[in-house]
């Protein structure tokens, strides 16, 4: 074991020593705008080149029936770009709000801007002075002050302004040592909200031309988030160029430009008023619920994902990468008969039930389009959302056989709060049983009605209670046929967990 550990350490040292010598970067202060033109990117290294070659080969040899797409039938799953033909331009001092479905490529977009992910095609322009706030807040061992200044020269006025805008004054005043209180190893432990605010403060304190804020308000309550968005993002940073990944309507309304991503493509780019004019059905769906912004981030993302899936299927969105033919949104009768009523109606079910998890697939796998009939998926909310989500959400997606398994597994992961990282998707695991509860039907609030909206066209009867065995049947798959695919989500989780 020691020998293997030593080898690992030697390899890491070797990798480090072989890297390009670090040089302090210069900045182009004459570049004021941030531009992205026709950007397409793959997470798999070198995949862009491979894809181009395959495309060329495809042009050279036509298939027997003249259908080019057949050549890509097995290729497209692994070759789906994480970003496809993305365009935007924002001037200095503007706020671009980036929203979109789960796994749509929002974080990947920021990675591309930072140069962490190299596109296979396109153009990116900015001054180079970037500050990034990750959705995963982090703290270094040291004082609060050190964690915020983080090596940047100290400016009292700037520091105080940032502390105030990020609502850290009250937290700091509680400690005898004030902002000299030590965090991390041997120090105090912070709450998730405090960590999030310190991480945001760190990003804001650094002087930059472009601020990339990746869902920075994690763990913050609705009121605090609203206040910090106003005081920090809108006021303190008013003259800075900002790109904010968000799922809040309030943020979209306040943004100068909006970019909505769906499955790696740009579903919409423009202003909020243009969104209302050009995509009235889509925007009214999301704004139809006054309490949309009161939902948890997970719930908002889920609703956004469902809505985008629905509208892209109805042909409102740009054609997806594999250019699937439009299919009816209505569910086939055959599918309704295949599933027992107990699965389709969890509303009356008050009792707890268990779900056997068969495989530890990661959530948010690439979703592939397919010509198979659409199926409705049972999607249950996690325990943490019981208060606001009594009804299960029904998600409508177009999936190939491979992704049916993924989507089912992601539902299981959602139900069981499962976070199994870095495991092989082929491995047959020992079944682990977790308990999930469905809250009883109380009075139907606007939230409940809203959660039904997406499935109002469905012709399914809602009755009985959930039968555990029936549910297990829904999620059974032959895992042998699934190819291994590493997505950005998996990669990001991996580096987050193993960052030491």
């Amino acid at each position: 074991q020691t020998w293997y550990d030593s080898l690992g350490a030697i390899n890491k040292i070797q990798d480090f020593l072989q890297k390009q010598e670090y040089k302090t970067l210069e900045y182009n202060l004459t570049t004021t705008e941030v531009v992205m033109e026709n950007v397409t990117a793959f997470w798999e290294e070198g995949f862009g080149e491979l894809f181009e070659k395959a495309k060329q080969n495809n042009n050279n040899r036509k298939t027997s029936n003249g259908d080019d797409s057949l050549f890509f039938s097995n290729f497209s799953l692994l070759g789906t770009p994480v970003l496809k033909d993305i365009n935007f331009k924002i001037e200095r001092g503007q706020l671009l709000a980036v929203a979109g479905s789960t796994g749509a490529g929002k974080t990947s977009l920021l990675m591309v801007i930072m140069g962490e992910l190299e596109p296979s095609e396109g153009k990116i322009k900015h001054s180079g002075r970037i500050s990034f706030c990750s959705q995963f807040s982090w703290i270094m061992p040291g004082t609060i002050k050190e964690n915020i200044i983080f090596g940047v020269s100290y400016d009292e006025y700037r520091y105080r302004s940032v502390i105030k805008a990020c609502q850290l004054e009250e937290d700091i005043s509680k400690f005898a040592e004030k902002d000299n209180i030590v965090l991390g190893e041997g120090g105090i432990t912070l709450s998730g909200g405090q960590r999030a605010r310190i991480s945001l403060a760190r990003a804001v304190y650094k002087d930059a031309d472009l601020y990339l804020l990746d869902s920075p308000f994690g763990y913050l309550d609705v009121l605090t988030e609203k206040e910090i968005f106003e005081s920090c993002v809108c006021k303190l940073m008013a003259n800075k160029t900002r790109i904010l990944v968000t799922s809040k309507m309030e943020h979209l309304k306040k943004a100068d430009k909006i970019l909505i991503l769906h499955e790696g493509s740009s579903y919409f780019y423009g202003t909020f008023s243009e969104l209302q004019n050009l995509q009235p059905d889509f925007s009214s769906k999301l704004m139809g619920c006054d309490s949309f912004d009161q939902f948890s981030a997970e719930r908002r993302n889920s609703i956004l994902t469902e809505t985008l899936h629905r509208f892209s299927l109805e042909g409102d969105a740009p054609v997806s990468w594999t250019e699937t033919k439009k299919q009816s949104f209505k569910q086939t009768g055959e599918f309704g008969e295949k599933r027992k009523n107990s699965i389709l109606n969890p509303i009356n079910s008050i009792r707890k039930f268990s779900i056997v998890q068969k495989t530890p697939l990661q959530m948010n796998g690439i979703e592939e389009d397919s010509d198979e009939p659409l199926e409705r998926r049972l999607s249950l909310v996690p325990d943490s959302e019981q208060g606001e989500a009594i009804l299960p959400r029904i998600s409508v997606i177009s999936t190939g056989p491979t992704l049916q398994a993924r989507r089912r597994q992601s539902v299981l992961n959602l139900m069981t709060h499962s976070v199994n990282q870095g495991q092989n998707i082929h491995r047959k695991t020992t079944a682990s049983t977790r308990k999930v509860s469905l809250a009883p039907q109380a009075n139907l609030t606007e939230l409940d009605i809203y959660s039904r909206r997406l499935s109002q066209e469905t012709g399914l009867e809602i009755s009985e209670e959930i039968n555990e065995e029936d549910l297990k049947e829904c999620f059974f798959d032959d895992m042998e046929s699934i190819p291994a695919v590493t997505t950005w989500n998996t990669y990001l989780r991996y580096i987050t967990v193993h960052k030491s």
């Epitope: 970067l25 210069e26 900045y27 182009n28 397409t40 190299e118 095609e121 153009k123 001054s127």
Partner: nanobody, 127 residues
Framework: QVQLQESGGGLVQPGGSLRLSCATS????????IGWFRQAPGKEREGVSC????????NYADSVKGRFTIYRDIVKNTIYLQMNSLKPEDTAAYYC????????????????????WGQGTQVTVSS
Amino acid sequence: QVQLQESGGGLVQPGGSLRLSCATSRFTLDYGTIGWFRQAPGKEREGVSCIRTSSGSTNYADSVKGRFTIYRDIVKNTIYLQMNSLKPEDTAAYYCAADEARLYGSSCLRMDEYDYWGQGTQVTVSS
């Protein structure tokens, strides 16, 4: 204004090698893209190779893949184009171009994407 200065051109026999240099400055070498283009007599200017200077990632035209190598020296602020196995059809005036944007894929081999150009250096491959 970005300054670009090419050098290293000359007369070489088929199968021989040459190394072209493009000296630049400032930001371009950190966040932009440097491209090499060539123009043979009576022909249009075409993209040969390019490099994203922040990451060192590269692209090549099909006609030079495996023979030409573009690389950078961040200390000397210089981009090099190492040309091996030269053929008579490689005879052309070679130009260094720069842009403050990062250009990827086919974008970085397109002339119209570049804002700054050098004066050019002549390469002649002949026996």
